[in-house]
């Protein structure tokens, strides 16, 4: 069942079917004998009770006040009264834009990230049984879609998808043709969730070591889920049996990003491990960033300024 009209302030476009549904509907059915009344007041005018005789455009059904269609002079305050229950709405009927397929003031804006799922479904549950056909327009040009009852777009968003999408439902009532338009302003934006991955610490690190001992080089980064972090060393990785890449550790940050850490373990350090670059790279769709480690014999550390050392 269609939910009730809970918003106290409503703006609608002239010339379209419209309805108000009060929010004690289930209760009203239980108390069939209770008097239920709809009133309108506009400006200085007192409450005027509404009934089908008030206007050929107005219809009353159970819990609903219908307009076929709503017009500019329907602007005003509406009341539903039943026993000690009252509901009030303020209705503002605005002019239709005659030069466009939609009225700018009646547009719902949506922001969709590029490559994220993007969906528009043309549905109108209240008038569903009366709708003959529905068309979907983009920037007022009709889109050719298979389903003319409920046209739908379901895809991964592209920048070209940006625009105004209007669902137009065509329906008959008492021999007259009406249409209801619902327009979405779709803005496609860059993937806001992605960050530029950052390698933590200095870009160049000299590590003081002793021959025959082991060392663990820790490479840490703040990155996106799909970003990769890896070590590069020597002519071809894996040529030195004393060098081992440990399993990457990942911890999710409160912001939904990842803190990754990858250790390169060098065992039984030899002369061949000294003064060569061990590069840690983080790669993302935005590119790469690299930080380098150089192993230096402890005896030689006096030759290098203290601030470049990593322990």
């Amino acid at each position: 069942a269609e939910s009730c009209t809970s918003r106290p302030h409503i703006t609608v476009v002239e010339g379209e079917p419209f309805y108000l549904k009060h929010c004690s509907c289930s209760l009203a059915h239980e108390i069939e004998t209770t008097t239920k009344s709809w009133y309108k007041s506009s400006g200085s005018q007192e409450h005027v009770e509404l009934n089908p005789r008030s206007s050929s455009r107005i219809a009353l059904h159970d819990c609903v006040l219908e307009f076929w269609p709503v017009e500019l002079n329907d602007t005003g305050s509406y009341f539903f009264q039943m026993k000690n229950y009252t509901q009030k709405w303020k209705l503002n009927v605005i002019r239709r834009n005659k030069h466009s397929c939609f009225t700018e003031r009646q547009v719902t804006s949506k922001i969709v990230e590029v490559k994220k799922f993007f969906q528009i479904t043309c549905e109108n549950s209240y008038y569903q049984t009366l709708v003959n056909s529905t068309s979907l327009y983009k920037n007022c040009k009709k889109l050719l879609l298979e389903n003319n009852k409920n046209p739908t777009i379901k895809k991964n968003a592209e920048f070209e998808d940006q625009g105004y999408y209007s669902c137009v439902h065509f329906l008959h009532h008492n021999g007259k043709l009406f249409n209801i338009t619902k327009t979405f302003n779709i803005t496609i934006v860059e993937d806001r969730s992605n960050i530029v991955p950052v390698l933590l610490g200095p870009k160049l690190n000299h590590v003081a070591v002793e021959l025959g001992k082991n060392v663990r080089l820790n490479c840490s980064a703040l990155l996106n889920e799909e970003d990769v972090i890896y070590w590069m060393f020597g002519e071809e990785n894996g040529s030195d049996p004393n060098i081992h890449e440990e399993k990457e550790m990942r911890i999710m940050t409160p912001e939904g990003k990842w803190h990754a850490s990858k250790v390169l373990r060098i065992e039984n350090i030899g002369e061949s491990n000294l003064n060569v670059l061990y590069n840690c790279t983080v790669a993302s769709t935005g590119g790469t960033d690299t930080k380098s480690f150089i192993l230096v014999r402890k005896a030689d550390m006096a030759d290098i300024p203290g601030h470049v050392f990593t322990r």
């Epitope: 590029v114 860059e190 889920e225 990457e248 993302s284 769709t285 935005g286 590119g287 790469t288």
Partner: antibody
Framework: QVQLVQSGAEVKKPGASVKVSCKAS????????ISWVRQAPGQGLEWMGW????????NYAQKHQGRVTMTTDTSTSTAYMELRSLRSDDTAVYYC????????WGRGTLVTVSS | DIVMTQSPDSLAVSLGERATINCKSS????????????LAWYQQKPGQPPKLLIY???TRESGVPDRFSGSGSGTDFTLTISSLQAEDVAVYYC?????????FGQGTKLEIK
Amino acid sequence: QVQLVQSGAEVKKPGASVKVSCKASGYTFTSYGISWVRQAPGQGLEWMGWISVYNGNTNYAQKHQGRVTMTTDTSTSTAYMELRSLRSDDTAVYYCARGWYFDLWGRGTLVTVSS
Amino acid sequence: DIVMTQSPDSLAVSLGERATINCKSSQTVLYSSNNKTYLAWYQQKPGQPPKLLIYWASTRESGVPDRFSGSGSGTDFTLTISSLQAEDVAVYYCQQYYRTPYTFGQGTKLEIK
């Protein structure tokens, strides 16, 4: 509109250099790396290298190391690929492409190396 | 470098029939830390730049018809066209973006039988 627009065809003599440009529009230029891919006549695709627009870092394929330079100008959202010491086997269509899976490509620039 | 090998080099399939192209990488392109597979498929028609069809091994690029699908993990991958259309005649390439240098397969030429 999201696009990569490349500079026009070039005819060069062996030993010369060529600089191909690739102007990006419709997206945030610094959010994606730019790769350069070439295709010799009737051949497959060859990745030459890429540049990280946000920090200027470059990765070149070993084959082109020392002969290729990739740069960007963020003020004009343009990427450049310069290839030096041209040889006849450098005759190819050179493409710029966005990201690490290449969801956006330039139309290509034909570079002909002939004496 | 990671070497990408496609098979077959060329393929002729009847209209409406299924076309299958294979791609093998010399080492894994599956990243255990996030369980993502760093493999893409492209379609290239004569005189045009390649067009991205599939990324992350199985995610269809927006606007690509659903007759195209990608599968596989680790080192063995497949591009399937469920019902071949005339406009699908092209050369198809796989590419890994797990490690630089990012490498392509040698290409598979798809024709109509």
